[in-house]
C-alpha cells in the first residue's frame, strides 16, 4: 500500500436545502483506471461511512440507489454532493481515495471538510 495526497476544502456551509458539495482532489502517481472514493464522517470521535463509489476513469461515479451522495469525476478530481443534510449531520467529512487498478494500490485520505448545516426556519403558518 502506497500513500497518496488528497486535498479538500477545510470548511463548507451547506445550502438552506441541506445540500453540500465539495471537490476531492488526489495526486495520482500513475495512470489508474479504477478508483474508489469513500466519504467518511467524523463526529464526537466516531467515524462512520457515509457513502462509497467505485468508478472507471472517464466514467460517472455510481453510488447505491439509496445513497445520499452523488458525484462526478474529471481527471484527478471528484466533485461530491451530499444531500438531505440536517443540523445534526454537521461534522467533519473525510474523503478517502483508493487507486484500485492497475497495481500498485494507492491510498489517500484527506484532512476532512467541516460541513456545517443549519435546519431551515419552519415556514410560518398561513391561512391559505
Amino acid at each position: 500500500c502506497k500513500a497518496m495526497h488528497v486535498a479538500q476544502p477545510a470548511v463548507v456551509l451547506a445550502s438552506s436545502r441541506g445540500i453540500a458539495s465539495f471537490v476531492c482532489e488526489y495526486a495520482s502517481p500513475g495512470k489508474a483506471t479504477e478508483v474508489r472514493v469513500t466519504v467518511l464522517r467524523q463526529a464526537d470521535s466516531q467515524v462512520t461511512e457515509v457513502c462509497a463509489a467505485t468508478y472507471m476513469m472517464g466514467n460517472e461515479l455510481t453510488f447505491l440507489d439509496d445513497s445520499i451522495c452523488t458525484g462526478t469525476s474529471s481527471g484527478n478530481q471528484v466533485n461530491l454532493t451530499i444531500q438531505g443534510l440536517r443540523a445534526m449531520d454537521t461534522g467533519l467529512y473525510i474523503c478517502k481515495v483508493e487507486l484500485m487498478y492497475p497495481p500498485p494500490y494507492y491510498l489517500g485520505i484527506g484532512n476532512g471538510t467541516q460541513i456545517y448545516v443549519i435546519d431551515p426556519e419552519p415556514c410560518p403558518d398561513s391561512d391559505f
Partner: antibody, heavy 117, light 108 residues
Framework: QVQLVQSGAEVKKPGASVKVSCKAS????????IGWVRQAPGQGLELMGW????????NYAQKLQGRVTMTTDTSTNTAYMELRSLRSDDTAVYYC??????????WGQGTTVTVSS | EIVMTQSPATLSLSPGERATLSCRAS???????LSWYQQKPGQAPRLLIY???TRATGIPARFSGSGSGTDFTLTISSLQPEDFAVYYC?????????FGPGTKVDIK
C-alpha cells in the same frame, strides 16, 4: 504569511449603510470561511455571521437578518460585509476572521465604524 | 442556540499566580469545537486554544485547556505581565457560533 487586512475606519449617519472589506492572503481563500465579529465599546464579542468562501453560502445572526449581507470575491480573495439602516448601537469595531471548523485562527486588524448624527 | 457562560467575570491575581477560568455551555459541545481567545485593549482577539486543549501556533506552554461536554477550563499556570487581558470561550459545534461574555484577568 497568512493574514487578513481590513478597510479603514468609517463614520456614518443613522439610516446609512457601511461596507467593510477584508482581503485575505497567504492561504487558499476558498478552502475556508470568513466570519464577521463586532465589538461595541466596552462590550464582548458578537458573531454577526459568516460566509463559506467555497460556495458563497451564508449564516447570519438572527438579530441582524435582513440588515446584513456578506459576500466574497474569489478573484481578489476579498470578503465584504455590508450593514444597512445603521443605528447608533451599531457603533463598534468590526473584525473579520478565518473560519476553519475548530476556532477562528486568523483575525483582521479591525475596522471602527461610528454611527453618529 | 448554545449559550456560553463564563466565570468569574473578573479575576484579580498577581504575576506568578495560577489563573483558572471556567466556561459552561447550555448544551453538550464536542470538545473538537471549543476554543479560547485572548484579547488585549485595542487589539484583535487571538486564538489561544482550539479543540478544548490544543494550543494554537506560538502560544506558550503555560496556557492549557481542558474539559468536555458542557464544562471547560482555561488554565494559565503562572501569570506573566502580558497575560492580563480578557479571555473568551467560543463554540463552533452548532450554528450559530457563540462566544461567552468573557473573563477579565487583571492585576491585583
Amino acid at each position: 504569511q497568512v493574514q487578513l487586512v481590513q478597510s479603514g475606519a468609517e463614520v456614518k449617519k443613522p439610516g446609512a449603510s457601511v461596507k467593510v472589506s477584508c482581503k485575505a492572503s497567504g492561504y487558499t481563500f476558498t478552502s475556508y470561511g470568513i466570519g464577521w465579529v463586532r465589538q461595541a465599546p466596552g462590550q464582548g464579542l458578537e458573531l454577526m455571521g459568516w460566509i463559506s468562501a467555497y460556495n458563497g453560502n451564508t449564516n447570519y445572526a438572527q438579530k441582524l437578518q435582513g440588515r446584513v449581507t456578506m459576500t466574497t470575491d474569489t478573484s481578489t480573495n476579498t470578503a465584504y460585509m455590508e450593514l444597512r439602516s445603521l443605528r447608533s448601537d451599531d457603533t463598534a469595531v468590526y473584525y473579520c476572521a478565518r473560519v476553519r471548523g475548530g476556532g477562528m485562527d486568523v483575525w483582521g486588524q479591525g475596522t471602527t465604524v461610528t454611527v453618529s448624527s | 442556540e448554545i449559550v456560553m457562560t463564563q466565570s468569574p467575570a473578573t479575576l484579580s491575581l498577581s504575576p506568578g499566580e495560577r489563573a483558572t477560568l471556567s466556561c459552561r455551555a447550555s448544551q453538550s459541545v464536542s470538545s473538537s469545537y471549543l476554543s479560547w481567545y485572548q484579547q488585549k485593549p485595542g487589539q484583535a482577539p487571538r486564538l489561544l486554544i482550539y479543540g478544548a486543549s490544543t494550543r494554537a501556533t506560538g502560544i506558550p506552554a503555560r496556557f492549557s485547556g481542558s474539559g468536555s461536554g458542557t464544562d471547560f477550563t482555561l488554565t494559565i499556570s503562572s501569570l506573566q505581565p502580558e497575560d492580563f487581558a480578557v479571555y473568551y470561550c467560543q463554540q463552533d459545534y452548532n450554528l450559530p457560533f457563540t462566544f461567552g461574555p468573557g473573563t477579565k484577568v487583571d492585576i491585583k
